[in-house]
């Protein structure tokens, strides 16, 4: 967890705290979805590996419009070190598999908390 | 239908060394993380600790360093406390807790508590 | 550690009360606060997470406000069943800590 990094802020944000706001955010999105998640778009599966921040914000930045997810876009580009523009792939895309982003913000979270809980416990 | 199923009462003479298990059922045992607390006679809560059922990592109370260790079995979903040293002032209900951090917090389910009695 | 000061320790209510119990962290725990009820010879029970968020199956009456250092358990009308002990822990970080507890007696 010491690789990720804070987001904008007054003051340095630890990183543990970085990604615990993440995640709940994505809890939150995951609780208030009433009508399909970005009106069911569909986004590129990525490999939960540790590019999988920048590779992440890659894939949901090709979805416009929806204003469930912007908080969370944000919030990953502040754990990818590089600008990330739409259009853009990296090699953690499984290029031949696309997913709702309603699938995609459940695996991303169910890969995040195991991430917070091996941060904490290690 | 969440359950955390602790092992029986335990009476042990000062010194010996006692194993607490508790099994989960109803959820994925490495999903959630897994702690342990005292209830002393008449007395609060105390967190001793917890550990990561999947990695096996832990996390612990400065006071109960060197007297509780934790293990978790990813074969038959349970989680194991060890007591050493035992001593008088170790007598007390123990528990076991768990849940999920995000959602129902980390002390959403407990087992039913295991009593712990050291007397010679 | 973090220290949570819970008061008051004790107190008597009738049914049909409204009951405020407080708790008090010695730093900010970003609203990771829990409220266990807790009946004598029986394991806690979990009423509240996140200092707001009711657990499934619990009834409306209780409620959890604060963010902060502050954080205050609410049950709205106080029902037979209700007599207990009450805990609160927060779980911002390690070492998770609890509140010393409030016994709610009958008046």
């Known amino acids: 967890l010491t690789c990720l990094g804070g987001f904008a802020s007054p003051g340095p944000v630890p990183p543990s705290t970085a990604l615990r706001e993440l995640i709940e955010e994505l809890v939150n999105i995951t609780q208030n979805q009433k009508a399909p998640l970005c009106n069911g778009s569909m986004v590129w599966s990525i490999n939960l590996t540790a590019g999988m921040y920048c590779a992440a914000l890659e894939s949901l930045i090709n979805v416009s419009g929806c204003s469930a997810i912007e908080k969370t876009q944000r919030m990953l580009s502040g754990f990818c070190p590089h600008k990330v523009s739409a259009g853009q792939f990296s090699s953690l895309h499984v290029r031949d598999t696309k997913i709702e982003v309603a699938q995609f913000v459940k695996d991303l979270l169910l890969h995040l908390k195991k991430l917070f809980r091996e941060g904490q416990f290690n | 239908e969440v359950q955390l199923v602790q092992s029986g009462a335990e009476v042990k003479k000062p010194g010996a060394t006692v194993k607490i298990s508790c099994k989960v059922s109803?959820?994925?045992?490495?999903?959630?993380?897994m702690h342990w607390v005292q209830q002393a006679p008449g007395k609060g809560l105390e967190w001793i600790g917890g550990?990561?059922?999947?990695?096996?990592?832990?996390a612990s109370n400065q006071k109960f360093k060197g007297k509780a260790t934790l293990t978790a079995d990813k074969s038959t979903d349970t989680a194991y406390m060890e007591l050493s040293s035992l001593r008088s002032e170790d007598t007390a209900v123990y528990y076991c807790?768990?849940?999920?951090?995000f959602g129902g917090g980390p002390f959403a389910y407990w087992g039913q508590g295991t009593l712990v009695t050291v007397s010679s | 550690d973090i220290q949570m000061t819970q008061s008051p320790s004790s107190l008597s209510a009738s049914v049909g009360d409204r009951v405020t119990i407080t708790c008090k962290a010695s730093?900010?725990?970003?609203?990771?606060l829990s409220w266990f009820q807790q009946k004598p010879g029986k394991a806690p029970k979990s009423l509240i997470y996140r200092a707001n968020r009711l657990v499934d199956g619990v009834p409306s009456r209780f409620s959890g406000s604060g963010s902060g250092t502050d954080f205050t358990l609410t049950i709205s009308s106080l029902q037979p069943e209700d007599f207990a002990t009450y805990y609160c822990?927060?779980?911002?970080?390690?070492?998770?800590?609890f509140g010393g507890g409030t016994k709610v007696e009958i008046k």
């Open positions: 109803g959820y994925t045992f490495t999903d959630y993380e």
């Open positions: 730093q900010d725990i970003n609203s990771y």
């Open positions: 822990l927060q779980y911002d970080e390690f070492p998770y800590t």
């Open positions: 550990i990561d059922p999947e990695t096996g990592g832990t």
């Open positions: 807790t768990s849940g999920d951090y």
